[in-house]
């Protein structure tokens, strides 16, 4: 086959998704590597092709888009799993080509399992809140594009294993979790579970993030000074012994 610009394995995008949940994965070519978007490419007669290499295998194979209930499908530059299975783990490649042009990139996809308390090998984003600062909100992340705005999902928030439902200082408000006043005791992992219907089926999206309650800007500024002084003292001490 003709030469193809191969961007290799994009390990910057370590995509992790939960087993038995929908996942939508955009082809990284248009996000990070090419200077044009999918619409432009499509209008210019370029075709986007997907294939994958299973975990612990070397053989590249086409993705089966003829599974029951369209479990895996492609829509524009997005690869959809409705839902994922554990053995979907592998390296996925999207290739953009026509007779005169070819560009491709691969990325790893890991399907991970979670327990009933949402513990998993998933790397968690950290959200900082300032202590006793007044109202602060966190938003259930990465759920855009899974359902149209006409669909009203139900959202349940958990701290660790426990559903948040009392009117304490942390209050679920749909896609937002509002901290009326952030306290050190609010440190921990927070999970939103978004449940929505699609074609007679019910899907769940689970998103967990770590909340870290930190000092205010003022106390943080003082902390930075103290830390700098500590480092300075440590280096001075070290050089004289």
């Amino acid at each position: 086959s003709e030469r193809c610009d191969d961007w290799g394995l994009d390990t910057m995008r370590q995509i992790q998704v939960f087993e038995d949940e929908p996942a939508r994965i955009k082809c990284p070519l248009f996000e990070h590597f090419l200077k044009f978007n999918y619409s432009t490419a499509h209008s210019a007669g370029l075709t986007l092709i997907w294939y994958w290499t299973r975990q612990d295998r070397d053989l590249e194979e086409p993705i089966n888009f003829r599974l029951p209930e369209n479990r895996i499908s492609k829509e524009k530059d997005v690869l959809w799993f409705r839902p994922t299975l554990l053995n979907d783990t592998g390296n996925y490649t999207c290739m953009l080509r026509n007779t005169t042009y070819c560009s491709k990139v691969a990325f790893p996809l890991e399907v991970v399992q979670k327990d009933s308390c949402f513990n998993s090998p998933m790397k968690l984003p950290v959200h900082k809140l300032y202590i006793e600062y007044g109202i602060q909100r966190i938003t259930c992340p990465n759920v855009d594009g899974y359902f149209p705005s006409s669909v009203k999902p139900t959202i349940t928030w958990y701290m660790g294993c426990y559903k948040i439902q009392n009117f304490n200082n942390v209050i679920p408000e749909g896609m937002n979790l509002s901290f009326l006043i952030a306290l050190i005791s609010n440190n921990g992992n927070y999970t939103c579970v978004v449940t929505y219907p699609e074609n007679g089926r019910t899907f769940h999206l689970t998103r967990t993030l770590t909340v870290k309650v930190v000092g205010s800007d003022i106390s943080r500024g003082l902390n930075d000074i103290f830390e700098a002084q500590k480092i300075e003292w440590h280096e001075h001490h070290h050089h004289h012994h």
Epitope: I135, T154, K163, Q165, F167, I171, E173, G174, S178, L180
Partner: antibody, heavy 118, light 112 residues
Amino acid sequence: QVQLVQSGAEVKKPGASVKVSCKASGYTFTSYYMHWVRQAPGQGLEWMGIINPSGGSTSYAQKFQGRVTMTRDTSTSTVYMELSSLRSEDTAVYYCARGFVTSGIDYWGQGTLVTVSS
Amino acid sequence: QSVLTQPPSVSAAPGQKVTISCSGSSSNIGNNYVSWYQQLPGTAPKLLIYDNNKRPSGIPDRFSGSKSGTSATLGITGLQTEDEADYYCQTWTYTGRLWIVFGGGTKLTVLG
């Protein structure tokens, strides 16, 4: 469309209790909180409390603590507000209102007039 | 006696601009979001502004909200006769217990 339909007007004697109902439709009942707000004749709005229809948890204004009880029936998408030991100053229009805590109260019932008179 | 202080009344002619103030403290307005409601005579209140300055769908952009420190302001431009109503500000306070608080209300009269 979202609708909150409240029960009809009530006349009660001092010392009695009143139970006002509020039937919700047009949205997922358990996805929003329900507030109760009252308005005495010619006066402003006064918040009484809030209920989470999902789990049934409540938070009441200090002023009404011990006298008010908010409950819900998820099978009929209805919330209830019961106020006991009524006195003449409890004469007011009582509103149920859907909303969150930090982003406003977006839909209101039509109001229920409760008159307390001997 | 309301925790949030509003002027009892304001008035202006049609087409004019009017502002309604709402004064609180650091334990309510200062650290939290403010909502505004319009109550036409004989009807239930209606949400005009939430999160200090956001309008629900269907609310015209003649209505605006702002917040500075421990005070909030509702602005109405291009006054219309149907704007004659009572206006309430609202926020909350949390000191171990949640408490939603309303201002005492402001009666807006559209002159003429």
